[in-house]
């Protein structure tokens, strides 16, 4: 099996942006890797975003994705934007070594992302 490491806690910025590193220990020489960010709330797991990349190439999420990222070796730097207080929760990094076979799955323990909505600016007279 494949070990995936990610930070336990991250605090989103006042602009609703959270970044964290997802690192995996590859048991083989994969050329195609898929990275997925999952959100776990209670026992429900939903997909936040996903990207497949070829080793040595850049990580590309879909245009409408709330995620961006860069990759370097077995390390992926993930950024999630547009977060609100209601999005506070556990975000799991899932890594799949897709090609060549065999397939390997790696699931991190999750990063608890805390999002605090900024206080509205007081009206000035």
């Amino acid at each position: 099996a494949m070990h995936v490491a990610q930070p336990a806690v991250v605090l989103a910025s006042s602009r609703g942006i959270a970044s964290f590193v997802c690192e995996y220990a590859s048991p083989g020489k994969a050329t195609e890797v898929r990275v997925t960010v999952l959100r776990q709330a209670d026992s429900q797991v939903t997909e936040v975003c996903a990207a497949t990349y070829m080793m040595g190439n850049e990580l590309t999420f879909l245009d409408d994705s709330i995620c961006t990222g860069t990759s370097s070796g077995n390390q992926v730097n993930l950024t999630i934007q547009g977060l609100r207080a209601m999005d506070t929760g556990l975000y799991i990094c899932k890594v799949e070594l897709m090609y060549p076979p065999p397939y390997y799955l790696g699931i991190g323990n999750g990063t608890q992302i805390y999002v605090i909505d900024p206080e509205p600016c007081p009206d000035s007279d």
Partner: antibody
Framework: QVQLVESGGGVVQPGRSLRLSCAAS????????MHWVRQAPGKGLEWVAA????????YFADSVKGRFTITRDNSKNTLYLQMNSLRAEDTAVYYC???????????WGQGTLVTVSS | EIVLTQSPGTLSLSPGERATLSCRAS???????LAWYQQKPGQAPRLLIY???SRATGIPDRFSGSGSGTDFTLTISRLEPEDFAVYYC?????????FGQGTKVEIK
Amino acid sequence: QVQLVESGGGVVQPGRSLRLSCAASGFTFRSFGMHWVRQAPGKGLEWVAAVWYDGSNKYFADSVKGRFTITRDNSKNTLYLQMNSLRAEDTAVYYCARGGHLGHFDYWGQGTLVTVSS
Amino acid sequence: EIVLTQSPGTLSLSPGERATLSCRASQSVSSSYLAWYQQKPGQAPRLLIYGASSRATGIPDRFSGSGSGTDFTLTISRLEPEDFAVYYCQQYGSSPWTFGQGTKVEIK
């Protein structure tokens, strides 16, 4: 709710072909890996094949490699298993199963019986 | 290929008794990638436990899973009549995905 419905099973002679289908509903089909698992009469579960997301990544058990092909049509929310050069030992109930976000097989179809006999 | 060996092959117990099923892997399996399924005659398998110890949606708390490395256990604390079935463990951390040969829990 998630539903998987297999079809296409039947009786076929050794050496012939058969195509199984699995119609999926109740979830975003393209976001999940899909599997075929079979069970010979009175025996245990045997994983057969898997196909990922856009269909470009496929994996097969050694027992079917070179004979079976797995495909998916995301526009039709349907999974397929093309079985060629069938043998008596391929006789089994074939289930399709969804690979959940965390990897386990969280939903299964009711199965379709394939009997290979002359 | 990771080979999973389940024991015992058959477990004969009475309703209300505790059932302990074992699954041993030929090489280390992270607990994140070990599942248990229940199958009744003529039915498809049903997910009980994933990640070695997390109960699937709708599964009663009399079912629990534990273990790590190469040794995993499914425990049914008090057998109900509907629990008599065949149970399979599975690893899903790498291909090929593999299942144990199953343990049949039958009424004594």
